[in-house]
């Protein structure tokens, strides 16, 4: 049903929501304070425009009772609960921020009248791409897909000659949540990725993908999985690998492979990691010192979402239009703003867009290189490294299938 | 045309206090994290306490934790070191530089814009 809206007569209210099922493990209290930085850049930015306004965030707690698995298995039902809770206490505000869960961003997404614009850090998932008042500020699964098919039919650099078109996909079940969406992706078989590739095969157990690693018989060199080194060990170990596999591991929000001094394991050398350039964030920030890796993402994405709101509100009401319209709800898309970090540039369907870079171990430094970028926003691939130094034969990346090719 | 002027700097007796202020023209301040530098005669200029854009964040130094503190007033394109118990070897030159985001950041080279200075000396 339709809720008034604290939004008008000078006031804008953002509705935060701080979910108990969340995509990531974040202590509530760095959402707090990452909302709380955002707001006083955008009451300074604001004021700085000559705009004599105000704007405040009312935190929605979920009471936790019922919905306390504390991830995003039970966040469904959590979400419309705490719709209800914004509903009956009258408390709507311009813009709703949270949920990060793909279950109840699509659910909340449903079944309410969203005449306003929810901003979600996460909702990775594929039924939440092209949803029309839905803004997402960390890496969709979409964007990976298309970056995947767009790397396997590369054919044209120094250091990839070959076109793929076959890949296993190892997916047990224990991932993160933003794994669990990106390799969710990756199998569904109506999926972009699915209708590109000629062949792939989902190994679920371990030893599948153990055995895997030296079999003769293999119908791909090419493994797609996601998270972080140690997640590798874990299941790879100091096994020995077939000369022509390649390990593609998805491993987005983490910074560790630039830091200074990180040293790269010898069982990362037959490994290309996937991750998001660090761009201007700054590792020896405060803003980051206390956060894991992943999680500094996380509280960031919620930052942005407060920079995002002031900025679209900015634009209103230099304007002088109506920020409880469709329109405005409509607007969170296709433009580029101020983030925390520098520009954040959003797609036509409110998805942020992003550098990813593809790193290499260098088989001389032990140092994680980058082999090549991708800018999601142009579904473009910049080679980096012309001549890296490969653990593969010639220095080329081999075929994906076994017995063409290097060997 | 970005400035950055500092006050409140002096002489005091070592245990004693002082306020430094740094008031910033040229651009919007809240977009920029703040910091304090300060620079003995003939030692390299070394970071002492950082605020965000926003004031939400801080860092300070290993050297001045617990006794310096930090603050900002967008409002007024301030920022602003409290000094207490102070020490000897905190006599400096104190420096505010403005960073290039509105991160938390505590080296040099993440910092675009330096004031004059502003000398604090502690007597014992």
């Known amino acids: 049903s339709q809720v008034s809206q604290n939004c008008h007569n000078g006031s804008y209210e953002i509705s935060v929501l701080m979910m108990g099922n969340s995509a990531f493990a974040e202590p509530l209290k760095n959402l707090e304070d990452a909302v709380n930085e955002g707001l006083e850049i955008v009451r300074g930015r604001l004021q700085n425009a000559g705009l004599n306004v105000t704007v405040n965030a009312t935190f929605m707690y979920s009471d936790g009772l019922i919905h306390n698995s504390g991830d995003c298995r039970s966040s469904t039902c959590e979400g419309l609960d705490l719709l209800r809770k914004i509903s009956n206490a009258q408390r709507m505000g311009c813009v709703l921020i949270g949920p990060s869960c793909t279950y109840s961003t699509f659910q909340m997404y449903l079944d309410t009248e969203l005449s306003y614009p929810m901003i979600s850090a996460g909702s990775f998932g594929l039924s939440c791409d092209y949803k029309e008042t839905l803004t997402r500020l960390m890496s969709p699964a979409r964007k990976l897909m298309y970056f995947l098919v767009n790397f396997w039919k590369t054919n044209d650099l120094p250091f990839k000659t070959y076109s793929w078109s076959t890949s296993y996909v190892y997916k047990n079940g224990t991932e993160t949540e933003d794994c669990f969406w990106y390799l969710n992706a990756l199998e569904a078989s109506v999926s972009y990725f699915s209708h590109e590739l000629g062949f792939k095969v989902v190994l679920r157990q371990d030893k599948e993908f153990q055995d895997i690693l030296m079999d003769h018989n293999r119908k791909s060199n090419v493994i797609i999985m996601c998270g972080g080194p140690e997640f590798l060990y874990k299941l790879k170990g100091d096994r020995a690998v077939a000369e022509d596999i390649v390990i593609i591991l998805v491993d987005l929000f983490n910074d560790q492979y630039f830091e200074d001094n990180v040293t790269a394991p010898d069982y990362m050398k037959n490994v290309l990691v996937l991750t998001l350039s660090p761009g201007n964030s700054l590792l020896n920030s405060s803003f980051s010192r206390n956060l894991s890796p992943t999680k500094r993402d996380f509280a960031l994405a919620y930052l942005n979402g407060i920079l995002l709101f002031g900025h679209m509100l900015k634009i209103f009401l230099e304007n002088g239009e109506n920020i409880t319209t469709p329109k405005f709800a409509h607007a969170f898309r296709n433009l580029t703003f101020e983030g925390y970090d520098g520009p954040v540039t959003l797609d036509d369907w409110g998805d942020v867009d992003s550098t990813m870079v593809l790193l290499y171990t260098s088989v001389d430094t032990k140092k994680y290189k980058v082999l090549l970028t991708y800018d999601t926003h142009v579904n473009k691939t910049y080679p980096v490294d012309m001549s890296p130094t490969f653990t593969w034969k010639n220095s080329k990346l081999p075929n994906d299938i076994t017995g063409r090719g290097p060997q | 045309q970005v400035q950055l002027v500092e006050s409140g700097g002096g002489l005091v007796q070592a245990g004693g206090s002082l306020r430094l202020s740094c008031t910033a023209s040229?651009?919007?301040?809240?977009?920029?994290?703040m910091g304090w530098f300060r620079q003995a005669p003939g030692k390299e200029r070394e970071f002492v306490a950082a605020?965000?854009?926003?004031?939400?964040?801080?860092d300070f130094a290993d050297s001045v934790k617990g006794r310096f503190t930090i603050s900002r007033d967008n409002a007024k394109n301030t920022v602003y070191l409290q000094m207490n118990s102070l020490k000897p070897e905190d006599t400096a030159l104190y420096y505010c530089?403005?960073?290039?985001?509105?991160?938390?950041?505590?080296?040099?080279?993440?910092?675009?814009?330096w004031g004059q200075g502003t000398q604090v000396t502690v007597s014992s």
């Open positions: 040229g651009g919007t301040f809240v977009n920029y994290g």
């Open positions: 530089a403005r960073a290039r985001t509105p991160r938390v950041v505590n080296r040099r080279h993440e910092y675009d814009y």
């Open positions: 605020i965000s854009g926003g004031g939400v964040y801080r």
